[in-house]
Interface confidence: medium
């Protein structure tokens, strides 16, 4: 079957997100991918969205992330804008209202996004073939 347009949008957003480091991409988030063997795809997307929402809700106005220079400020603003877009699209793909995120494992946001990108690309290659 055809790939969902949302999936393409997610990959595009993830490509943009992983291209550029900001002051806060090294901050840690809950690593939902560490033990996701018994998790459905929809649950994974839902939990990923939850993690991203927790991150940007907490760090959107974090002055450590906003930095001191105009460039740092705008890079962080762009990061948050992309994370919100990703969150919205993941919820759409998941089709679930809520999902628990209880893992103790942590990873950097940068690694989390790279892992998510790999998963999304794998999904895309399956649905486009």
């Amino acid at each position: 079957h055809k790939c969902d347009i949302t999936l393409q949008e997610i990959i595009k957003t993830l490509n943009s997100l992983t291209e550029q480091k900001t002051l806060c991409t090294e901050l840690t988030v809950t690593d939902i991918f560490a033990a996701s063997k018994n998790t459905t795809e929809k649950e994974t997307f839902c939990r990923a969205a939850t993690v991203l929402r927790q991150f940007y809700s907490h760090h959107e106005k974090d002055t450590r992330c906003l930095g001191a220079t105009a460039q740092q400020f705008h890079r962080h603003k762009q990061l948050i804008r992309f994370l919100k877009r990703l969150d919205r699209n993941l919820w759409g793909l998941a089709g679930l209202n809520s999902c628990p995120v209880k893992e103790a494992n942590q990873s950097t946001l940068e690694n989390f996004l790279e892992r998510l990108k790999t998963i999304m690309r794998e999904k895309y290659s399956k649905c486009s073939s």
Epitope: A70, Q71, H74, Q78
Partner: nanobody, 116 residues
């Protein structure tokens, strides 16, 4: 042509107040976020405060939080910065900047000197 004209700078004693204004023209002011950025003598540019297009969302650098207030009047195409409890380290040229993914247009700046 985009034009940003700052005013309101001057010499003030520590603990004093100033209100900076920035008159904007040449673009649809109400559609853009705006910022105040400063440059202290011999130092690089530092963003001070940012406000979204509607005036509802604001950001402040740690160094000015609780002392400075950014606001805007979209009917007058004007950006403001109310600066209270001024310190010597606030001495700088203050620029108003149009914000659209980066600070792409700047004014000429207004000098604020905090000294006793």
């Amino acid at each position: 042509e985009v034009q940003l004209l700052e005013s309101g700078g001057g010499l003030v004693q520590p603990g004093g107040s100033l209100r900076l204004s920035c008159a904007a023209s040449g673009f649809t002011f109400r559609n853009y976020g705006m910022a105040w950025v400063r440059q202290a003598p011999g130092k690089g540019l530092e963003w001070v405060s940012w406000i979204d297009a509607s005036g509802t969302e604001t950001y402040y650098a740690d160094s000015v939080k609780g002392r400075f207030t950014i606001s805007r009047d979209n009917s007058k195409n004007t950006l403001y910065l109310q600066m209270n409890s001024l310190r010597a380290e606030d001495t700088a040229v203050y620029y108003c900047a149009k914000s659209s993914g980066r600070f792409d247009y700047w004014g000429q700046g207004t000098l604020v000197t905090v000294s006793s």
